[in-house]
Structure formats: C-alpha cells, structure tokens
C-alpha cells in the first residue's frame, strides 16, 4: 500500500509525499514523477513556482538538489530562510517535487485522479489530493529493485517529524533569498500540524529575484520538519476543463 499526498500545481510544480513521511530515494523520485507524466523540476522551474506562491515545509528532490521552497520565513521551515533553500548534504530519503509541462502557468488545484504512466503491478496506490479526496489504483511505478525491496526499510514511526530524527548528518545549506515580506495571518492551513507555522507572512511583490545571488549557511536537517506540505486550501475537480489536468 502506497499513499501519495500531492499538492496544487504552481507553474506545473507540485510536491509529493509518500506514506506520510520522508521515504523517497532519488531514483524513486524520478520514477514517481515519470508515473505522474512529469519530471523532476529544474531549479529554474522551482524558482518560477516559488515566485507565484508555491511553498512547503518539506525537503524534496528536484533535479540535482534537495530543497524546500519558502516564501514566508518560519523558524521550523528551512531555518527561517526564504527562497529555494538547498540542503547540501542529502544522504537520506526525502519527499519529491515534480513538474508537469501540461499544467497551467500559475496555480492549478484540480484533482489528480490517477498515475497515468504507472505500469502493471500488485501495489495499491492511493493518490490523496489536498482536500482529502482519494483515488485508488493497482500498479507499480518503481524500477529500481532497491526501492521496491529496500535493504534497510524506513521505520514507520520515523520521519513524520524532523528529518534529523533519522539522520545524524549535519550539513550545509545554500539558499536563494528574495525580497521583503509583510506579515498577515494565514486563514487555513490544513496540511500544517505545528501551530507555530500557522502565521506566515504574505508577499505583495509581483516577481522575485535573488537578492545578491546565493547565500550559504550551515545547520542541521531539522529545519524542514512539519508533517505535511503545502500551506492551506483545498481542491476538487469541478466544471469544464480549460487546460489539460495533470495527469493527462
């Protein structure tokens, strides 16, 4: 049984969490995105998504990096930093981000109902949309035997909190910072369980550009610990299709 929690798409980028914990390897991340008719996002694609409102509090794979996109500073998400926050010592399992080129250019919260590129298999795969709607199918998407039959399985009660609970690695981070934020209360954050993450700020800038390029700091992996992903909202399928929903 595999549960895949997914978010709205922002400029085609979305977050996928497997079984409610950090449990995806880099090879599985690529396979999972492929199953969603998607690819691992590039840094440029992630930065575009960030610039139109995409943020999470979870480490996830993109092409070449493990990142958390942050708009609003929060002490428990990416060490209070904003921008695309890069974890430089990525030696463990994380969530993943995916990019679907067929998604609309800004926010798309229509429900994803299946894994179009999954192949035949015995696994019950449940896609859980942000509003809790669930779509179940049998199949498989993993191609790496180590992902299907891991030699050291992830313990079920680990990594729903901070990733430092299962990794003693203390590594550096690189993050891209963006312009100033102005606090207002967020009204609904069903994905976020830690109450300290319920009062993010909001941006009123139209676009964001790295201020002074990249900045480097150091810390532990414990920054992205909130169980859940995108902050706020709900989604269901409704009405006539304007652009292709993902997956196609």
């Amino acid at each position: 049984q595999i549960d895949l929690n997914i978010t709205c798409r922002f400029a085609g980028v979305f977050h996928v969490e497997k079984n409610g914990r950090y449990s995806i390897s880099r090879t599985e991340a690529a396979d999972l995105c492929k199953a969603f008719n998607s690819t691992l996002p590039t840094m440029a694609q992630m930065e575009k998504a960030l610039s139109i409102g995409f943020e999470t509090c979870r480490y996830g794979f993109i092409e070449g990096h493990v990142v958390i996109p942050r708009i609003h500073p929060n002490s428990i998400c990416a060490a209070n930093n904003t921008g695309v926050y890069i974890l430089t010592s990525n030696t463990s399992q994380y969530d993943t981000y995916c990019f679907n080129a067929s998604a609309p250019p800004e926010e798309d919260c229509t429900s994803v109902t299946d894994l179009p590129n999954a192949f035949d298999g015995p696994i019950t795969i449940t896609i859980v949309n942000r509003d809790g709607t669930r779509y179940v199918q049998k199949g498989e998407y993993r191609t790496n035997p180590e992902d299907i039959y891991p030699s050291n399985p992830t313990d079920d009660d680990v990594s729903s909190g901070s990733s430092s609970e299962r990794s003693s690695t203390s590594g550096g981070y690189i993050f891209y910072t963006f312009s100033t934020v102005h606090p207002i209360p967020d009204e609904d954050s069903p994905w976020i369980t830690d109450s300290t993450d319920r009062i993010p700020a909001t941006r009123d800038q139209d676009t964001f550009h790295p201020s002074g390029g990249s900045h480097t700091t150091h810390g532990s992996e414990s920054d992205g610990h909130s169980h859940g992903s995108q902050e706020g909202g709900a989604n269901t399928t409704s009405g006539p299709i304007r652009t292709p929903q993902i997956p196609e």
């Epitope: 250019p105 798309d108 954050s189 909001t202 941006r203 909202g233 269901t236």
Partner: antibody, heavy 117, light 112 residues
Framework: EVQLLESGGGLVQPGGSLRLSCAAS????????MNWVRQAPGKGLEWVSS????????KYADSVKGRFTISRDNSKNTLYLQMNSLRAEDTAVYYC??????????WGQGSLVTVSS | DIQMTQSPLSLPVTPGEPASISCRSS???????????LDWYLQKPGQSPQLLIY???NRASGVPDRFSGSGSGTDFTLKISRVEAEDVGVYYC?????????FGQGTKVEIK
C-alpha cells in the same frame, strides 16, 4: 450556477476606507486563485490584486500597493478587498474574478466605488 | 508586465458584414502545454465584461458560433462572421499567462 456577487461599494471621502466583499457560489471556491479587476468610468480594465487558493500569497498592482489588502475566507466562500487611503483615482467599478486554473475565468457584476469629497 | 495592444480602437460595422479585431502581446502567450493564454471579452454598455473566447480559440459556453478566435504566440485575431446589432460594445483582449493580467485598450464596435 457559477456566480460571483460583489458588495460593499459606495461613496467615500478621499483618505477614507471601504471593504468590498465577493460571495462565490456554484464552484469550489477554495480551488481557485481569485482576483480583483477595476474599471474607472469610461476607461479600460485594470487588474488590481490576486490571492492564491490558500490565502497565503498575494499580489498587487503598483497603483494600490500598501493601501489595498486582498484576503479570503474559504469557509465562507468569500473574497475581500480592504481599501484604505482612498484617492479620487480609485473611483471605479470593482469586479471580482475567478482565476482561470483549468477553467475559464468568471467575473462578477461589479461594485461601484466613488471617492469624492 | 506583458503589454497588450489592440487595433483598431474604433470599428464601425454594418449588420450582416464580417468584422475583425487584432490583438498583439509584447511576449509570447504560448505556454509549454501548447495553449495560448489569451482571452477575448465583450463589454456591452452598462454591463460587466463577458467572456467570449478563452485559450485563444475556445468559445465560452453560450457564445454564438459567429465569434471565433485565432492566432498564436504574440498575434491574435477575433472575428465576427456576420455582425448583429447585439454585438455592439467594447471588445477587450486579455493575457492570462501570468499575473498581473493585462488588457488591450479596447475596441469599440458600433453600427454604422
């Protein structure tokens, strides 16, 4: 039926405040980025502000930045525009509009805001 | 921001005759998903704008088939195959590729 209904417009003095509301029905409000667009008398259309589905990310036109605040209450299916420090040039019909996402944009009928002494 | 330019700004028409309005954007509105994020609206006197065409060429629900949209990238056209009296008003093109939404100046269509 998909519907957006604006309210809260009226006559206000320069420097004053007003809050517009937009009640949504007939669709899943919490799925959509929402927008405010305005039209000054005899003029064209001007986008004012937008807010993503969660309410956690907003954008504003330069002409209203720092004076207007967009917000939403997904539990009430309602969009708001708080307008402070109003100026004569803010006089317009204000439309709330559903973002396009995977479906065509939907507009309300508009609410007239007149800023005059 | 993406700039939108419409022409002509005024279009006197004869009922039963065709009419055409042009819209040009300062950057391509063709998204990687293959759709052009260009909408056409008609604002009749005293009314709110009503959607005619979305994604460049898709007629909105309830819009008569005499209206058609075409074009790709930066150049778009709205055509009315046979103008009727009820088609008078101001026509706007709008780009929906990115926020801020931006609009053409409007084309006023009136009966000769």
């Amino acid at each position: 039926e998909v519907q957006l209904l604006e309210s809260g417009g009226g006559l206000v003095q320069p420097g004053g405040s007003l809050r517009l509301s937009c009640a949504a029905s007939g669709f899943t409000f919490s799925n959509y980025t929402m927008n405010w667009v305005r039209q000054a008398p005899g003029k064209g259309l001007e986008w004012v502000s937008s807010i993503v589905s969660s309410g956690g990310f907003t954008k504003y036109a330069d002409s209203v930045k720092g004076r207007f605040t967009i917000s939403r209450d997904n539990s009430k299916n309602t969009l708001y525009l708080q307008m402070n420090s109003l100026r004569a040039e803010d006089t317009a019909v204000y439309y709330c509009a559903r973002g396009w996402s995977s479906q065509p944009a939907i507009w309300g009928q508009g609410s007239l805001v007149t800023v005059s002494s | 921001d993406i700039q939108m330019t419409q022409s002509p700004l005024s279009l006197p028409v004869t009922p039963g005759e065709p009419a055409s309005i042009s819209c040009r954007s300062s950057q391509s509105l063709l998204h990687s998903n293959g759709y052009n994020y260009l909408d056409w609206y008609l604002q009749k006197p005293g009314q709110s704008p009503q959607l005619l065409i979305y994604l460049g060429s898709n007629r909105a629900s309830g819009v008569p088939d005499r209206f058609s949209g075409s074009g790709s990238g930066t150049d778009f056209t709205l055509k009315i195959s046979r103008v009727e009296a009820e088609d008078v008003g101001v026509y706007y093109c709008m780009q929906a590729l990115q926020t801020p939404w931006t609009f053409g100046q409007g084309t006023k269509v009136e009966i000769k």
